[in-house]
């Protein structure tokens, strides 16, 4: 049977606003990554900032409600933004626990149809695990 | 199929620790919780903790926090359960779950001096 | 903790009769993602538990379609439509809403 999606909880330091409020926090000490139980959704999120081929976690937590892409087993991020000349970030939604933990590539930050550098990849099969 | 395989039956005297373990097999170990229950002789079911093998997360009762460790080996598929300062009423059958669908056979613990 | 209360505690039944068990909780069981997370196990003699219903009313697989589970919020109900030998046991409702999750006291159903 079905647990309450539980998601991986993650702030860098200086992003405004906050998501904690989306769910319960899991006491799961200091060596392991901080986990939060969804409240109102059973979708996680992440969001990826990417600069010159590196990137780097800016949040990952609850949705506050299951959206569309929230049906996805794994993270498949899509660019959405660019805060600044160079970096795009790339958000992704799925529906499995702990599904925001990685993703297995990032899409070119270019728009779609748009000739754009690749985001670092992944090994075929395999994962990169975000370091928190 | 998915089974769960718990270790042998236990006797300690008050305490001391347990450590028990619980062998999965037939499903993609590291994809589901594996849930701690127990069921004190004559009682009903009471639930202790959970664990994702994935990234060894767990979430507890409270009444256990402190005195269980969950821990999982993902090379061997196998979750283990330790409680610590065992009491009398301890004495109970400790069954692993695969997210509360399939269950191990139980383990009998009895605590006694 | 939410009490779950299960009545009747003990439940002698004909064979090819049906059945009702009920669950009342003490806390609405209804999550803010909109499920119910509400679950019904069979112990029989001398066995684990075993997944009968999660989710209030959606069996698991190879449960016979003669268990339904129904109910919302607080009150819920599993009905067997006709009783059959293989289903004597104790029959325990458990939430996974609410931390720490709980289990009723169990329903000791028996061949009349």
């Known amino acids: 049977p079905p647990n309450r999606r539980t998601c991986v909880f993650f702030e860098a330091p200086g992003v405004r606003g906050s998501t904690k409020t989306l769910g319960e926090l899991l006491d799961t000490g200091t060596e392991l990554p901080r986990a939060i139980r969804c409240l109102y959704s059973r979708c996680c999120f992440g969001i990826w900032n990417l600069t010159q081929d590196r990137a780097q976690v800016e949040m990952q937590g609850c949705r506050d409600s299951d959206e569309p892409g929230c049906e996805s087993l794994h993270c498949d991020p899509s660019p959405r933004a660019h805060p600044s000349p160079g970096s795009t970030l790339f958000t992704c939604s799925c529906g499995t626990d702990f599904c925001n933990a990685n993703y297995s590539h990032l899409p070119p930050p270019g728009s779609p149809g748009t000739p754009g550098s690749q985001g670092p990849q992944a090994a075929p099969g395999e994962s990169i695990w975000m370091a928190l | 199929q998915v089974q769960l395989v718990q270790s042998g039956a236990e006797v300690k005297v008050p305490g001391a620790s347990v450590k028990m373990s619980c062998k999965a097999s037939g499903y993609t170990f590291t994809d589901y919780w594996v849930s701690w229950v127990r069921q004190s002789p004559g009682q009903g079911l009471e639930w202790i903790g959970e664990?994702?093998?994935?990234?060894?997360?767990?979430n507890f009762n409270e009444k256990f926090k402190g005195r269980v460790t969950l821990t999982v080996d993902k090379s061997t598929s196998t979750a283990y359960m330790e409680l610590r300062s065992l009491r009398s009423d301890d004495t109970a059958v400790y069954y692993c779950?695969?997210?509360?669908?399939?269950w191990g056979q139980g383990v009998l613990v009895t605590v006694s001096s | 903790d939410v009490v779950m209360t299960q009545s009747p505690l003990s439940l002698p039944v004909t064979l090819g009769q049906p059945a009702s068990i009920s669950c009342r909780s003490s806390q609405s069981l209804e999550y803010g993602d909109g499920y119910t997370y509400l679950e019904w196990y069979l112990q029989r003699p001398g066995q684990s538990p075993r997944l009968l219903i999660y989710g209030v009313s959606n069996r698991f697989s190879g449960v016979p379609d003669r268990f339904i589970g129904s109910g919302s919020g607080t009150d819920f109900t599993l009905k067997i439509s006709r009783v059959e030998a293989e289903d004597v046991g104790v029959y325990y409702c458990f939430q996974a809403t609410h931390d720490p999750n709980t289990f009723g006291a169990g329903t000791k159903l028996e061949i009349k």
């Open positions: 779950t695969r997210q509360r669908d399939y």
């Open positions: 664990i994702y093998p994935k990234n060894g997360v767990s």
